[in-house]
């Protein structure tokens, strides 16, 4: 068990021309909270998935009033640390989701207002017990610098906080096999107390009170050899004559999902499908409220009216469900004309049309220049019964309508992925990198820079601690 | 340079345990985040995943076919084995082995393919 | 399981031109364990794109990869005739981890 802790240091207009306008006026005066959602592993950050690790929400920060005629400063930022308490171990790598979020403190009917400023979204790899991490991620024209860092709670320690440790017995040494507890030299690693009962040969615990069960045996407390119908033969399992084998228990064996989760097996873990009320890595978290930050995509958490409903999320355009967790398939009213493919980019719907047709539900049908407009300064040119666009710079697509992708250019180097934004593009980068480009790489403690990509990767592709 | 090589009995029997070997160079299952995976195609038809194989010895098997699976590997050799009892004629087919790298838990892949072999079941 | 479906299972099409594929899942991926791959008649299959969007090394430019949840896009911009092949989406997420049944692109 542990905290993660984040702390904001400052959240404000980024470098570069064009910069925002303050969220908050005399008129309307405002003031900033954070969210964070966190999920194990290197998952999607912007997945309909729960935040598996946890999620919290600030404090209120000032109340701020914008100078007229002034440029937006960096924003008055709320007091202390984000922490998101985790039960399980520290993954090691993770996902997160930091959003700003500005309550308007005017005259609105049915008391303040909330609107979602910015949001920034990355990968990391980090150690519990580590240093604070440095980050700067960029939304739009805001700048988000924060740092973070992952904690053990006592008893716990160790890189992912699964190592207990207890203090000394003796003063001069540990006991037989137990090494001391770094940095905490005066303390012992105590030995891993597996589930009462758990079979020593056949089970084994890397957590206290669990008991995982070596290839060949299951049952909660391993002691049940591993068999199916067609191995029993007078030779017993493994038979040569019946050429029956005898798989190892897989991890969703005695399904280590609780509270009627349902439980897949991944490349090399599993995953918990948890049921409306429940979530974490078993689904083992329950009681949600608004503090656990359970809507998803953008999605306003307020406090239910009645006991039996903690929570109502209010969906931005585009979502729906309890927990805004459904994207609405706007493509199923069939928009694109002429046999049209319906793209629904979230923000937006884009349809693909067929050659021949164009428009921005493929409504023009294209038989030459004659009639035919290129929009944003672009160019008509006749060839093969078709016409085509020869469009100005910054603009694409058939009619020349479309903004070109700012992502083209694939502008996240090191292996930053780049999603287009509706004010330009946001970078997500990878491990060992931060900045607006993710062009600085990051050495926490004075590290290295990150080791060579394992074969098969090429240089810029998302790169690995081996 | 990454290279595998599958081998196998080429034809066999109904009921008989089908034994193949993937042989491996370019990298090695004592490094963290490599592993190793088998792949089988029917002839002109889709692949279907078997079963995989990690460095640590983390395992994976289709439950389709998890009763009739075993996969183990020799490090020291750059070997994998797979092992399928029972087979029948349904089971003939090429079988790929492919390596498998978890780039971080960010993604996993089959990032590099042996050329197959093929294996008929025929009484 | 995830059952992917891709379409068309068959496609013509001119050189030049470009080309769009699908591949729909039952239930959910994470884009990140979402792969296409490439094989030709006779041999072995290769890693074409990975987590849906990142070209594999020596890839040319013009293939590229989108999409999330259950719809997936594979996108020649310009079809030239050594992209004739068979391409295969694959799901590295949940087990059993499963194939398409391929989308067979031919030169008209």
């Known amino acids: 068990a542990g905290v993660f802790e984040l702390q904001i240091h400052s959240f404000g207009p980024g470098p570069g021309p064009g910069a925002p306008r303050s969220p908050c006026s005399a008129r309307l005066p405002c003031r900033l909270f954070f969210r964070v959602c966190l999920k194990p592993g290197l998952s999607e950050e912007a997945a309909e998935s729960p935040c598996a690790l946890g999620a919290a929400l600030s404090a209120r920060g000032p109340v701020y009033t914008e100078q007229p005629g002034a440029p937006a400063p960096d924003l008055p930022l709320p007091d202390g640390l984000l922490q998101v308490p985790f039960r399980d171990a520290w993954p090691g790598t993770f996902s997160f989701i930091i959003e700003t979020w500005r309550e308007e403190l005017g005259d609105q009917i049915g008391g303040p207002a909330w609107s979602l400023l910015a949001r920034v979204a990355g990968r990391r790899r980090l150690a519990a017990g580590g240093p604070w991490a440095r980050d700067i991620q960029r939304a739009g024209a805001w700048e988000l610098r924060f740092s973070y860092r992952a904690r053990c709670e006592p008893p716990a320690v160790g890189t992912a906080c699964t190592r207990l440790c207890r203090p000394r017995s003796a003063p001069s040494r540990c006991g037989p096999g137990l090494r001391p507890c770094a940095p905490l030299e005066d303390e012992c690693e105590a030995p891993l107390v597996c589930r009462a009962g758990c079979s020593p040969e056949h089970g084994f615990c890397e957590q206290p009170g669990e008991c995982r069960c070596l290839e060949g045996w299951t049952g909660p407390l391993c002691t049940v050899p591993v068999s199916t119908s067609s191995c029993l033969s007078p030779r017993g399992p493994s038979s040569a004559t019946t050429g029956c084998l005898v798989p190892g228990p897989g991890p969703c064996d005695g399904n280590p999902c609780a509270n009627g989760g349902s439980c897949s097996e991944t490349p090399r873990s599993f995953e918990c499908t948890c049921p409306r009320g429940f979530y974490g890595l078993r689904c083992e978290v329950s009681g949600v409220t608004c503090a656990d930050g359970p809507c998803f995509n953008g999605g306003l958490c307020v406090g239910g009216a009645d006991p039996d409903s903690a929570y109502i999320c209010h969906c931005p355009p585009g979502f729906q469900g309890s927990n805004c967790e459904k994207r609405v398939d706007r493509c199923s009213l069939q928009p694109c004309r002429n046999g049209g493919l319906c793209l629904d980019l979230g923000h937006a719907l884009r349809c693909r049309c067929r050659a021949g047709f164009a428009g921005p539900r493929c409504e023009h049908d294209l038989d030459d220049c004659a009639g035919r407009a290129c929009a944003n300064g672009g160019t008509c040119v006749e060839g093969g019964g078709a016409h085509r666009c020869s469009c100005a710079l910054g603009f694409g697509g058939r009619d020349c309508r479309e903004r070109a992708d700012p992502c083209a250019a694939r502008p996240c180097a090191h292996g930053g992925r780049c999603y287009a934004h509706f004010s330009g593009l946001v970078c997500a980068c990878a491990p060992g990198y931060m900045g607006a480009r993710c062009e600085f790489p990051v050495h926490p403690d004075g590290a290295s820079a990150l080791p060579a990509a394992p074969p098969g990767l090429r240089p810029g592709d998302p790169q690995r601690y081996l | 340079q990454v290279t595998l090589k599958e081998s196998g009995p080429g034809i066999l029997q109904p009921s008989q345990t089908l034994s193949l070997t993937c042989s491996f160079s370019?990298?090695?299952?004592?490094?963290?985040?490599?592993?190793v995976g088998w792949i089988r195609q029917p002839s002109g038809k889709g692949l279907e995943w078997l079963a995989h194989?990690?460095?640590?010895?983390?395992?994976r098997y289709n439950p389709a076919l998890k009763s009739r699976l075993t996969i183990s590997k020799d490090t020291s050799s750059s070997q994998v084995f797979l092992k399928i009892a029972s087979v029948d004629t349904a089971d003939t087919a090429t079988y790929y082995c492919a390596r498998i790298a978890d780039y971080g838990g960010d993604y996993y892949a089959m990032d590099y393919w042996g050329q197959g072999t093929s294996v008929t079941v025929s009484s | 399981q995830i059952v992917l479906t891709q379409s068309p299972a068959i496609m013509s099409v001119s050189l030049g031109e470009r080309v769009t594929m699908t591949c729909t899942a039952s239930?959910?991926?994470?884009?990140?364990?979402l792969h296409w791959y490439q094989q030709k008649p006779g041999s072995s299959p290769k890693l074409w794109i990975y987590s849906t969007s990142n070209l594999a090394s020596g890839v040319p430019a013009r293939f590229s990869g989108s999409g999330s949840g259950t719809s997936y896009f594979f996108t020649i911009s310009s079809m030239e005739a050594e992209d004739a092949a068979t391409y295969y989406c694959h799901q590295y997420h949940r087990s059993p981890f499963t194939f398409g049944a391929g989308t067979k692109l031919k030169i008209r």
């Open positions: 239930s959910s991926v994470s884009s990140s364990y």
């Open positions: 194989i990690w460095w640590d010895d983390v395992k």
């Open positions: 370019g990298f090695s299952l004592s490094t963290s985040g490599m592993g």
